[in-house]
């Protein structure tokens, strides 16, 4: 038996930040679980982890180069990624594992979310504008 995961197909980070919500076909309340976010088509780079259990507060881990926070819903984990760089544009996959109570469960691979990080293109106003035309 596998948990199903739903993610937005695409998110655009205009201000170098994005909320990626991972929605599960499973209630995480009073469970020990590990939710993670993986970068790349082959899910090779784990960038963010949220660990939760019934007796302590949520623990969030960010890989060096990523600034990540996590929020827990009954059937979701939302990863808040900040300070993203344009070169971190990629497809990101949500993963979930539930360890306790038994049985151990994990998810069917999701379709992923393309996070498109838009660069900040600031148009500076000229310091010394030319003479205005009448």
């Amino acid at each position: 038996n596998k948990i199903l995961v739903k993610q937005s197909p695409m998110l655009v980070a205009y201000d170098n930040a994005v909320n990626l919500s991972c929605k599960y076909s499973y209630n995480l309340f009073s469970r020990e679980f590990r939710a993670s976010l993986h970068k790349g088509l082959d899910s090779a780079v784990e960038v963010c982890v949220v660990y939760g259990n019934y007796s302590q507060q949520l623990q969030v881990y960010s890989k060096t180069g990523f600034n990540c926070d996590g929020k827990l819903g009954n059937e979701s984990v939302t990863f808040y990624l900040q300070n993203l760089y344009v070169n971190q544009t990629d497809i990101y996959f949500c993963k979930i594992e539930v360890m306790y109570p038994p049985p151990y469960l994990d998810n069917e691979k999701s379709n992923g979310t393309i996070i498109h990080v838009k660069g900040k293109h600031l148009c500076p106003s000229p310091l010394f504008p030319g003479p205005s035309k009448p």
Epitope: R34, S36, E46, V49, Y51, Q59, Y61, D106
Partner: nanobody, 124 residues
Framework: EVQLVESGGGEVQPGGSLRLSCAAS????????MGWFRQAPGKEREFVAA????????DYAESVKGRFTISRDNAKNTVYLQMSSLRAEDTAVYYC?????????????????WGQGTLVTVKP
Amino acid sequence: EVQLVESGGGEVQPGGSLRLSCAASGRMFSNYAMGWFRQAPGKEREFVAAINYRRDDADYAESVKGRFTISRDNAKNTVYLQMSSLRAEDTAVYYCGFTYAGWASSRRDDYNYWGQGTLVTVKP
């Protein structure tokens, strides 16, 4: 809950070698990392080396690169620290740590569980 038991510490002469072991037990997920930190008398606990479950990510403190090697046996849930060319400044209590992060983290705050420590003494 994860339990960690270290072994392998002892006294050795400068230039000598030791191998530390750390066995983990408890509920494990498909990825996590284990690391070694050390604490000399009157000093902060500092990062030495770490490795993740998939063994595709390892990291070392600059001071031990080329002298120490971290490895793990996933079938035994055990991580090893092979220490060679030991110096007097390597004398410390060595602690094994466990983190739910899936990469070789050097950040002490990422580690959730710690072993009891094993003493390594390097002296002529």
